[in-house]
Every structure is written in C-alpha cells, then in structure tokens.
C-alpha cells in the first residue's frame, strides 16, 4: 500500500506521458489522477514504466474500479496485465476477441499463467462455447490449449470449430480428450473426399472406434506408423492382419520395429501366427496353429 502524500508543486500530471517514468512511486500515487489514467490507458504500454511503478498504476485503477475494470480499460492494460491476479480477472467481463488477443500478446512466449488461464476461462464462459475464431486465437498463442481442457469442456466445442485445429494442437491430448474430439472432427469433415478426409482426420484418430478404422482400411490411406501407434488399443485389437496391412499400406514394414510396444504388441497376441507370417516381417507371438481362441468377454456378456 502506497502512503497518501501531497503532490509536490508543479508535478501534477496533466497527461500520461514519459515524464512520469522519473516519478518516484509515492509521486505517481500523489500526482496521477486515476480517472486521467483510465482515459489514457492506451498510452501506458508505450511508456517504459518499471515493474514497480506498474504496481502504483494498478492500485489507482483498483481504487477507481473496485467492482472490476471496464473493457475499455482492460483492452489497453498491456504490461499491467502481468500485475493482475486471477481474483482481479474474475471480476472482469471480457467480450471482445480483440481484447483477448491484446492481453495474450503480453504473455506471448511464456507458458500459460494462472492469470491467462482465468482470462480464457472467463472469456469462453461469457461466449457460451468455444467458437472457431476464439479457438483459432487461443491455439495460435498456446498450441497445447485444446489438450488442457477436460473432456467435459471439450464437449462444448462445436464441430465447426474443429476446422481451426492444427495437428500440433493435439500433440498432448490424451485418449479421453480425443474420444470427445474425434466424433466432432468426423462430423466436420464428413463432406470431404477420401484422401482429403484422411489428411484432416488423421490427427484425431486416437479417438476412432474399430468400425471407422475398418472403413479406412478399405480406402488405401497408407497410415503412417506414428499415427497407428496413437490409436486406441481396444480399437486396434479386433482388426485382422489383412485390415492392418491395407490400413498401413507400404508402412506395414514398420510393425517389426514396434512389435514390443502397444498397441502393436497386444494386437500381435490376438492374431494367428499363420496370418502374421503372411506379412513376411518375422512378427512373433501370435496364436499357434491349431489353437482355439475363445472370446471370454463375449461369453460373459451373454450370460
């Protein structure tokens, strides 16, 4: 808290300008009118105030707007945003995407701070859903943003927003998140032709069910091993050797290098060794010839 002291003669600020950087903290407190500051917030970011001086400016705004800053002030906060706590931000009502962009720009190059997370949360909740423009903006600043959302939060993403998602935005998503995103992507890209569709849907396939993988195997997609390794194990297990061969195309040879890793390892254990041998890759661990495979899970479901 800065002490209340009278402004020295001749130092009263008539406008927010660079002469203020040479004011001591108590002089800023005493000589800068909060209402003047609020109306000239657009100048603050261009003035090289020290981090400590920004404390005083924040204090003045807090006194002027105890219930939270209006958006006209928020959009010009600039580096003052770094001084805001999540509690401060929860009082705001940010509706403009331009305001959001301006504040994210201040934090650019840094990891998502609690302040930024709170700001985004307030903004998205205010909009009611994560629309395409918002998602575009957020993933541009934070490629991992989508994967930081819970499956419940992702359920509010409309399929139309999926067009804004880039493959790198999904890098850190877990299967539960892809389970939610995949059906939306399938819906978003449904009118595209085979090869174009596969290019778009590829990064979402970690959420694809068996029947969709079977369908893809009929379309000469030549899925790469990196994508295959990210598929749900439970979706891969029912695939036949022939289906996997069609799905991977020339990339099928890569199975050998991955035979000890999931889902390839588990899939091999479910295949007849005879069938695996037809690939000519030397994959071992399949079911020996003459053995009968009982699907106990199916039996339990029936009883």
């Amino acid at each position: 808290e800065v002490e209340k002291t009278a402004c020295p003669s001749g130092k009263k600020a008539r406008e927010i300008d660079e002469s203020l950087i040479f004011y001591k903290k108590w002089e800023l407190e005493a000589c800068v009118d909060a209402a003047l500051l609020a109306t000239q917030m657009d100048r603050v970011n261009a003035i090289p105030f020290t981090y400590e001086q920004l404390d005083v400016l924040k204090h003045k705004l807090d006194e002027l707007y105890p219930q939270g800053y209006p958006e006209s002030v928020i959009q010009h906060l600039g580096y003052l945003f770094l001084k805001m706590s999540p509690e401060d931000i929860r009082k705001w009502n940010v509706t403009s995407l331009e305001t959001l962009k301006a504040l994210l720009e201040v934090n650019k190059g840094h990891e998502m701070s609690p302040q930024v997370a709170t700001l985004i949360d307030r903004f998205v909740k205010g909009r009611g859903q994560l629309d395409k423009d918002t998602l575009d903006t957020l993933t541009a600043f934070y490629p991992g943003y989508l994967c930081s959302l819970s499956p419940e939060e992702l359920s509010s993403v409309p399929p139309s927003s999926i067009w804004a998602v880039r493959p790198q935005d999904l890098d850190t998503c877990d299967p539960r998140q892809l389970d939610v995103l995949y059906p939306k992507a399938r819906l978003a890209f449904q009118n595209m032709n085979g090869s174009e569709y596969f290019v778009k849907i590829q990064s979402f396939l970690g959420g694809a069910p068996t029947e969709d993988l079977k369908a893809l195997s009929q379309q000469n997609v030549s899925m790469d091993l990196a994508t295959f390794m990210k598929l749900r194990t439970d979706a891969v297990l029912p695939l036949t050797v022939a289906e996997v061969q069609k799905l991977l195309g020339p990339h099928v040879e890569g199975l050998k290098a991955e035979e000890r890793h999931r889902p390839v390892r588990d899939w091999i254990l479910r295949q007849r060794q005879d069938d695996l041998d037809t690939l000519g890759l030397g994959l071992q661990g399949g079911i020996p010839n003459g053995y009968l495979v009982l699907d106990l899970s199916m039996q339990e479901a029936l009883s």
């Epitope: 001591k24 090289p48 020290t50 400590e52 920004l54 580096y79």
Partner: antibody, heavy 119, light 107 residues
Framework: QVQLQQPGAELVKPGASVKLSCKAS????????MHWVKQRPGQGLEWIGM????????NYNEKFKSKATLTVDKSSSTAYMQLSSLTSEDSAVYYC????????????WGTGTTVTVSS | DIVMTQSQKFMSTTVGDRVSITCKAS??????VAWYQQKPGQSPKLLIY???NRYTGVPDRFTGSGSGTDFTLTISNMQSEDLADYFC?????????FGAGTKLELK
C-alpha cells in the same frame, strides 16, 4: 540468434564528437527499447538512456542529457549514440543493450565500443 | 538516484568454495534486481533477474536471493570459469543503476 554488433574502437580528440553505432539482428528491431550503458575502466556500469526504435521516443539519465543523443535508423536496424564535447572522462566502453519489458534487466548486450579521448 | 553498493570490490576464492556476493540498495527496490557476470574483454551476461530467477542456460550453482534492500548472489560450487566481475542492477526506478562490481580472484 539475437545479436547487437558494435564497432570495436573509436579514437577521438578532446572537444570533438563521436557517433557510435549498434546494429541489431535476429529479432524485430522496432519492438524493443534500446538502452545504452557506459563502463569506465575498472569501474561499474552507468545507464545513459534509452530509445524506442518505432516511435523515436527517448529517455535519458539526467547526468547524460547534455552529453548523449540517441537516434535510430529503422531501415538498417541500427541504433546510434552521439557523444559531444568529449573529455578524458568520456573514455570508456559503451554498450547498447536490449531489455526485457517491463522488468528492465538486459538479456542481450552489444559487443561494446571502446572510446578513447586523446590528443 | 538509488545507489547499489557492492561493499567487496574483491573476493578471494578457491575452486569448490561457496561464494556469496552482496549488494545493498539505498532504498527499497522490492525484487527488481538483476545480476550480471562479466569476464575480461567481454560484455556483461545476465545471470539472475527479479532477484531470484535464474536466466536461461545459467548453471544451477548460481542462485539469487533477497528483497527490499539486501541482495545476495551465491555460487554454491565455485568453478575456475566463474572467475569474473559480478554486478548487481536495480530496475525499480529510473535512472537504472548498477553496483560497482565484485571481482572474484583465486586465492
């Protein structure tokens, strides 16, 4: 990578002026303030002032107001500092430095120019 | 102007030592202090910012501490390549000011 390149040395006569240059590369020159710092042999560092390449706005340490003039040439991403009425007290190494806003510590320093004032 | 005082101009150390370099501000500067290392014929290099944050690529044997008026740069396990001048800087208010420096030498 981010670099601030300065000439190695300048020899000037007392009473004369000298214009030091600092060529920036590896970042958007117009997005960062440029500061200048003086270091006399065996002594500490002194902050001279700063200039914003985009606006041309300058702020000086009171001590250097009548000694230094800061300018920029945006087209060549170069900052300049002119030192006038030189005396032996001005013999020093002069650095340009890029700050981290709004914390004002310097993460990138120029290579430094040694100014020698001698007749 | 805020005066940054580094009372020890020179400090004698040996490899493996724990070395603490101090800096005192003439008034409260919060945590707005940075530390720089400078070797002969080279430009200063940022080590610590905001009193205690280690800059990218700086070995973890360098740590900064303090707030208000008293600040310390500690080298926990002195190495020969750490022989240099060390400067503190305050960025709490203008003009920005630096300490006069502390030179680390071998005993």
């Amino acid at each position: 990578q981010v670099q601030l390149q300065q000439p190695g040395a300048e020899l000037v006569k007392p009473g004369a002026s000298v214009k030091l240059s600092c060529k920036a590369s590896g970042y958007t020159f117009t997005s960062y303030w440029m500061h200048w710092v003086k270091q006399r042999p065996g002594q500490g560092l002194e902050w001279i002032g700063m200039i914003h390449p985009n606006s041309g706005s300058t702020n000086y340490n009171e001590k250097f107001k009548s000694k230094a003039t800061l300018t920029v040439d945006k087209s060549s991403s170069t900052a300049y500092m002119q030192l006038s009425s030189l005396t032996s007290e001005d013999s020093a190494v002069y650095y340009c430095a890029r700050p981290v806003v709004p914390y004002w510590y310097f993460d990138v320093w120029g290579t430094g120019t040694t100014v020698t004032v001698s007749s | 102007d805020i005066v940054m005082t580094q009372s020890q101009k020179f400090m004698s150390t040996t490899v493996g030592d724990r070395v603490s370099i101090t800096c005192k501000a003439s008034q409260n500067v919060g945590t707005a202090v940075a530390w720089y290392q400078q070797k002969p014929g080279q430009s200063p290099k940022l080590l610590i910012y905001s009193a205690s944050n280690r800059y990218t690529g700086v070995p973890d044997r360098f740590t900064g501490s303090g707030s208000g008026t008293d600040f310390t740069l500690t080298i926990s396990n002195m190495q020969s390549e750490d022989l240099a001048d060390y400067f503190c800087q305050q960025s709490s208010s203008y003009p920005l000011t630096f300490g006069a420096g502390t030179k680390l030498e071998l005993k």
